[in-house]
């Protein structure tokens, strides 16, 4: 195995608010990552940078610094929140997200995350990209893995 493994687990929660005048949607999306240290020594997770894309447009960015130290042969689960804004040329989504006649207002977002660990002055970066379903019509808490885009496309076992 590589010395550090990063696994994007999924969306943990999405909290939504609206600006009626600006026809803008604000989504605070909390994601969960598992970082595993396969080394014999502790590693320092220096930062996590994340961004969210909708329809190939970046709608939110976040950066966490001095995250944690992970011991040898250990795994830590880390939550991080990305504030996103769907507005302007995407304001047409406001109508979909606020439509009362439908129960679930799922949109597909691309989650990108990069974890940086530092080794004696040089950095190792590990990146992940995942498509996730997020409900833009209400506050939602997800079971881990429940928002996975590809999982939803699979037939039920």
């Amino acid at each position: 195995p590589r010395s550090i493994d990063v696994k994007y687990i999924g969306v943990k929660s999405a909290y939504v608010s609206y600006d009626v005048q600006k026809r803008t949607i604000y989504l605070n999306i909390t994601n969960t990552l598992n970082i595993t240290n396969n080394n014999y020594y502790s590693v320092e997770v220096e930062n996590i940078t994340a961004q969210v894309q909708f329809s190939k447009t970046v709608i939110g960015k976040a950066r966490l610094n001095n995250i944690t130290i992970i011991g040898p042969l250990d795994m830590k689960q880390i939550d991080y929140t990305v504030p996103t804004v769907i507005a302007e040329e995407m304001s047409y989504m406001y109508d979909f997200c606020t439509l009362i006649s439908i129960k679930v207002h799922n949109i597909v977002l691309m989650m990108q995350v990069t974890v940086t660990t530092t080794y004696f002055g040089h950095s190792e970066q590990i990146s992940q990209e995942r498509y996730q379903y997020v409900d833009c019509g209400r506050n939602t808490t997800y079971q881990l893995g429940q928002s996975e885009y590809l999982n939803v496309l699979q037939p039920q076992q």
Epitope: Y40, Y41, S42, V43, L73, D74, M75, F120
Partner: antibody
Framework: QVQLQQSGAELVRPGTSVKVSCKAS????????IEWVKQRPGQGLEWIGV????????KYNEKLKGKATLTADKSSSTAYMQLSSLTSVDSAVYFC???????????????WGQGTSVTVSS | DVLMTQTPLSLPVSLGDHASISCRSS???????????LEWYLQKPGQSPKLLIY???NRFSGVPDRFSGSGSGTDFTLKISRVEAEDLGVYYC?????????FGSGTKLEIK
């Protein structure tokens, strides 16, 4: 002072299992790794595996094909090694040892248990 | 697996002699942080192994300075400058860079 006290000698039947313990004292148990080493009579040393008692994370020597299972109990500062489906080739002395670590570096096996003799015989 | 080849298997010496034990790894044992984790242990009859040298050349506390380790890449050496009676036993090199970690086959230091 640092001590690793291992359980006593075992005489066991083929096909059964045995659990060897290694009780740590004199240091912070969860701040060190515990390694296990095998020595067959008159033979050299063979690395079995390692556990981080703080997290329960393990690495094993795959050549031993799941023979050993390593666990640790933080409350009693004790590491365990369970050996299963025992055969005559598992007759050996088993040692535990501690290994220190820090950020981006680790140390050697500086303290060892006295060894536990396991004899597999019908 | 990384094969650790130790020579000689047996090393008869007289007390006060110099002794040298070689350990060769079948591949580089530099770990991903740039360090080489090659260790030397001495096991006396009926006892647990004891740490002598770590990271190729660092003497463990309490180990006499007549013991020295050297080497890099795949070739490593343990030297004893003046052998004393308490030094007799089996010496093992051990690499901690590639899983499974592996010991050398051992070198028995004995009186001529």
């Amino acid at each position: 002072q640092v001590q690793l006290q291992q359980s006593g000698a075992e005489l066991v039947r083929p096909g059964t299992s045995v659990k060897v313990s290694c009780k740590a004292s004199g240091y912070a148990f969860t701040n060190y790794l515990i390694e296990w080493v095998k020595q067959r009579p008159g033979q050299g040393l063979e690395w079995i595996g390692v556990i981080n008692p703080g997290s329960g994370g393990t690495k094993y020597n795959e050549k031993l094909k799941g023979k050993a299972t390593l666990t640790a109990d933080k409350s009693s500062s004790t590491a365990y090694m369970q050996l299963s489906s025992l055969t005559s080739v598992d007759s050996a002395v088993y040692f535990c040892a501690r290994r220190g670590y820090t950020i981006y570096d680790f140390y050697a096996m500086d303290y060892w248990g006295q060894g536990t003799s396991v004899t597999v015989s019908s | 697996d990384v094969l650790m080849t130790q020579t000689p298997l047996s090393l008869p010496v007289s007390l006060g002699d110099h002794a040298s034990i070689s350990c060769r790894s079948s591949q580089s044992i530099v770990y991903n942080n740039g360090n080489t984790y090659l260790e030397w242990y001495l096991q006396k009859p009926g006892q647990s192994p004891k740490l002598l040298i770590y990271k190729v050349s660092n003497r463990f506390s309490g180990v006499p300075d007549r013991f020295s380790g050297s080497g890099s890449g795949t070739d490593f050496t343990l030297k004893i400058s003046r052998v004393e009676a308490e030094d007799l036993g089996v010496y093992y090199c051990f690499q901690v860079s590639h899983v499974p970690f592996t010991f050398g086959s051992g070198t028995k230091l004995e009186i001529k």
